[in-house]
């Protein structure tokens, strides 16, 4: 699995996506959770509605929160007010059984600032960017807002 | 075993420049968040700067940010610090540190022997 | 910036006695905190880690307290090898940021 680098600002949310194909994972719950080291577990954080079918609905665990488009296929991970303690490897998972596929591997880092970004000096806005290895950056921030553009909505 | 050792440090006339690295070995050095500690003489401990894992996020001390610049080679299990326009209070022995938490930060538990920077005319 | 202000500055005890070192937050800090030991020549030694966690390594004797703002080191029987100078440092909120330091030297 690539590993997709999500990036956010401490003290403000970050959401974190994750596709699959909905048709394959019809009718399992997903959840999200946190490695703590290169062997050890996966550690669950949070997971959708016991029933399936009201994936959608909001689950929270602390500041933590999912909800699953079943039909088109996103898992969604709000971090709300990160914190620097948030950043680490972290897996979206496709549940079955006592099993569990890995959707994708998510790098979260937390930055102390907007301008503590490796390119301090462009603008930059959610989106791909720069490789680790094998994976790639998502942006989950922006850096300063040209005139006539249009903010991005407020997270509480 | 699990090692830092620095490197680079020297004297230097204000205004002038100097590259530290610091060579890690005895774990995946691209599983951690890497970072520089200096100690002026007779004084604390103080952050310079750190590095994610994948280099891409970063974090300097005011003190230093503008004139520092911080990066990791994964491939060389390396880690470095540019200073530029150095001055006296940037005299210390800065020391390389291994960030505690997989993929993520937390207390340095593991530190190299540290490198010497003197900024004197 | 979150302060940390660490006490006593210095702390003359003999082997054997008990020692009992303070860091107070400016603000809270959870459990977010570490504490290291220096000696004179040597880097820093991570004793302890989310306030109450010894460190691969670390004897027993050194146990770490506290939550929020008021977190206390305990070393319960100090040896020779302890004499040291102590730091704190939190890592709750950018800037993370050391205490002064205490110095625990022998009376």
């Known amino acids: 699995h690539n590993t997709t680098v999500f990036q956010g600002v401490a003290g403000q949310s970050l959401q974190v996506s994750c596709p699959y194909d909905s048709m394959k994972h019809w009718g399992r719950r997903k959840a999200w959770c946190r490695q703590l080291g290169e062997k050890g577990p996966c550690q669950r954080v949070v997971s959708t509605h016991n029933l399936w079918l009201l994936s959608f609905l909001r689950r929270w665990n602390g500041s933590t929160a999912i909800t699953d488009d079943t039909l088109g296929g996103t898992l969604t991970i709000t971090l709300r007010n990160l914190q620097p303690h948030d950043a680490g490897l972290y897996q979206c998972q496709s549940l079955h059984g006592s099993e569990a596929d890995t959707l994708r591997k998510v790098l979260v880092e937390v930055l102390a600032d907007p301008l503590d970004h490796r390119d301090a000096g462009d603008l930059w806005f959610p989106g791909e960017s720069e490789s680790f290895e094998d994976a790639h950056v998502e942006h989950s921030i922006s850096r300063s807002l040209l005139e006539g553009e249009i903010p991005f909505p407020p997270t509480s | 075993q699990v090692q830092l050792v620095e490197s680079g440090g020297g004297l230097v006339k204000p205004g002038g420049s100097l590259r530290l690295s610091c060579a890690a070995s005895g774990f995946t050095f691209s599983d951690y968040y890497m970072s520089w500690i200096r100690q002026a003489p007779g004084k604390g401990l103080e952050w310079v700067s750190y590095i994610s894992s994948s280099g891409s996020t970063i974090y300097y001390a005011d003190s230093v940010k503008g004139r520092f610049t911080i990066s990791r080679d994964n491939a060389k299990n390396s880690l470095y610090l540019q200073m530029n326009s150095l001055r006296a209070e940037d005299t210390a022995v800065y020391y390389c540190?291994?960030?505690?938490?997989?993929?993520?930060?937390?207390?340095?538990?593991?530190w190299g022997q540290g490198t010497t920077v003197t900024v004197s005319s | 910036e979150i302060v940390l202000t660490q006490s006593p500055a210095t702390l003359s005890l003999s082997p054997g006695e008990r020692a009992t070192l303070s860091c107070r937050a400016s603000q809270s800090v959870s459990s977010y905190l570490a504490w290291y030991q220096q000696k004179p020549g040597q880097a820093p030694r991570l004793l302890i880690y989310?306030?109450?966690n010894r460190a691969t390594g670390i004897p027993a004797r050194f146990s770490g307290s506290g939550s929020g703002t008021d977190f206390t080191l305990t070393i319960s029987s100090l040896e020779p090898e302890d004499f040291a100078v102590y730091y704190c440092?939190?890592?709750?909120?950018?800037?993370?940021?050391f205490g002064g330091g205490t110095k625990v030297e022998i009376k």
């Open positions: 440092q939190q890592d709750s909120a950018f800037p993370f940021t």
């Open positions: 989310d306030a109450s």
């Open positions: 540190a291994r960030l505690g938490g997989y993929y993520s930060l937390g207390p340095m538990d593991v």
